[in-house]
């Protein structure tokens, strides 16, 4: 939602967290601001304090409950407001009617581990974190592998078009250090975006057996 020169963007992690970023040109530096969430069909409301992340941008997380509790559904609409202190009052700086399941960004996948590693192959598994049971199997993943001498940006993306929490990396170089990352996205939601990348998992392929053809 945009008001004046302000941009207000929020995402729901599908369980109990709404993360918001508010940016504004020439915003007051010393003002206390917060995000306030008012669901249309729930008894609770929630507030978080916006903290600076850059010169003209602030962020905060609305914690709606226990991490794995299902606090919102596809029919919920949450009025989200940015409020900034002026004198003793609060001023509404931005407002949006937020449809949580149209604005999804899941938590980064966790518990990455090497299941099996060979000279040219590596099987890696992971878990999704705090993802709603509503998705059933309607998730997709992207993965990337960092090779020596390259950057993450140069790494080709591997797409898994189904809920598959493992991958077998092939055509790897023996006795070489690699790093691996994965991210997840629900298929649902007009403004849904990819989760952050997982923490990188470092692994090393096995050296080629001495005196054998590789």
């Amino acid at each position: 939602a945009v008001n004046g020169t302000s941009q207000f963007t929020c995402f729901y992690n599908s369980r109990a967290n709404i993360s918001c970023v508010w940016s504004q040109d020439g915003a007051l530096q010393d003002t206390s601001c917060q995000v306030h969430a008012w669901p249309d069909r729930r008894r609770w409301n929630q507030t978080c304090e916006l903290l600076p992340v850059s010169q003209a941008s602030w962020a905060c997380n609305l914690i709606l409950g226990a991490p794995d509790s299902q606090k919102l559904t596809t029919v919920d609409i949450v009025t989200l407001r940015v409020l900034c202190r002026e004198g003793v009052r609060w001023r509404v700086m931005a407002i949006q009617d937020f449809k949580p399941f149209e604005n999804l960004r899941l938590m980064a996948p966790i518990s990455l581990q090497v299941v099996h590693v060979e000279t040219h192959r590596c099987n890696i598994s992971w878990e999704i974190s705090q993802a709603s049971h509503y998705f059933e199997r309607h998730l997709e993943f992207e993965a990337r592998t960092l090779s020596p001498g390259h950057t993450w940006e140069e790494a080709p993306l591997l797409t898994l078009k189904q809920k598959q929490e493992w991958i077998c990396l092939e055509t790897l170089t023996p006795d070489t250090q690699y790093e691996f990352q994965v991210r997840v996205k629900p298929l649902q939601g007009e403004f849904t975006t990819w989760s952050p990348w997982s923490q990188p998992l470092a692994f090393r392929t096995k050296p080629a057996a001495l005196g054998k053809d590789t």
Epitope: N3, G4, S6, A27, E86, V88, R89, R91, V92, M93
Partner: antibody, heavy 121, light 112 residues
Framework: EVQLVQSGAEVKKPGASVKVSCKAS????????ISWVRQATGQGLEWMGE????????YYNEMFKGRVTMTRDTSISTAYMELSSLRSEDTAVYYC??????????????WGQGTTVTVSS | DVVMTQTPLSLPVTLGQPASISCRSS???????????LEWFQQRPGQSPRLLIY???NRFSGVPDRFSGSGSGTDFTLKISRVEAEDVGVYYC?????????FGGGTKVEIK
């Protein structure tokens, strides 16, 4: 029905202090701000500052800082405005007015009847 | 501080005729949230001020539709389409965009 009832007229000597009260009814006192506005005889309106009774937080117009103190007593839904070091230019009608804690639309919707303060030697 | 200047100081009008009051601010009063917090108050003789218009053109509850507000940036206008006897009094513009909030000097509406 929202009502703000103010204390009666006061006559004060220069250098003295005056304390004006504003009793609220017909709404939840701690949910709204109380602003104070003054109007010198034959003059315009001047916003002095305000208090949020919910937490006692105050904000004063720089013009009155150091001389004005706004307080409240939530047990009797009453706000107070005290002005010290009075001079003849402070002769005015002092109004309290209610305002929304979140300034969405307007600053002040309901006003008290006003309290006349006369500063004279 | 934002200075609000009203014209005219005095406005003699005929019952049933329109009236127009101008208010000019010394700087733009568009708030950084994109809204313009320009309000109009009416003060009848011997009474407290009463809110008529907020955010330039919105009528407060119970205000007759003969009152209308318009304008943007630094120039604003209050119009009374057909003046009635009960409209006599002083009208003040007010800006709530920049602290300290400030009032105009007032325009006295009287019947000719």
């Amino acid at each position: 029905e929202v009502q703000l009832v103010q204390s009666g007229a006061e006559v004060k000597k220069p250098g003295a202090s005056v304390k004006v009260s504003c009793k609220a009814s017909g709404y939840t006192f701690t949910d709204y701000v109380i602003s104070w506005v003054r109007q010198a005889t034959g003059q315009g309106l001047e916003w002095m500052g305000e208090i949020y009774p919910g937490d006692g937080n105050t904000y004063y117009n720089e013009m009155f800082k150091g001389r004005v103190t706004m307080t409240r007593d939530t047990s009797i839904s009453t706000a107070y405005m005290e002005l010290s070091s009075l001079r003849s230019e402070d002769t005015a009608v002092y109004y309290c007015a209610r305002g929304s804690y979140t300034y969405d639309n307007y600053a002040m919707d309901f006003w008290g009847q006003g309290t006349t303060v006369t500063v004279s030697s | 501080d934002v200075v609000m200047t009203q014209t005219p100081l005095s406005l003699p009008v005929t019952l049933g005729q329109p009236a127009s009051i101008s208010c000019r601010s010394s700087q733009n009063i568009v708030h950084s949230n994109g809204n313009t917090y320009l309000e109009w108050f009416q003060q009848r003789p011997g009474q407290s001020p009463r809110l008529l218009i907020y955010k330039v053109s919105n009528r407060f509850s119970g205000v007759p539709d003969r009152f209308s507000g318009s304008g943007s940036g630094t120039d604003f206008t209050l119009k009374i389409s057909r003046v009635e006897a009960e409209d006599v009094g002083v009208y003040y513009c007010f800006q709530g965009s920049h602290i300290p909030w400030t009032f105009g000097g007032g325009t006295k509406v009287e019947i000719k």
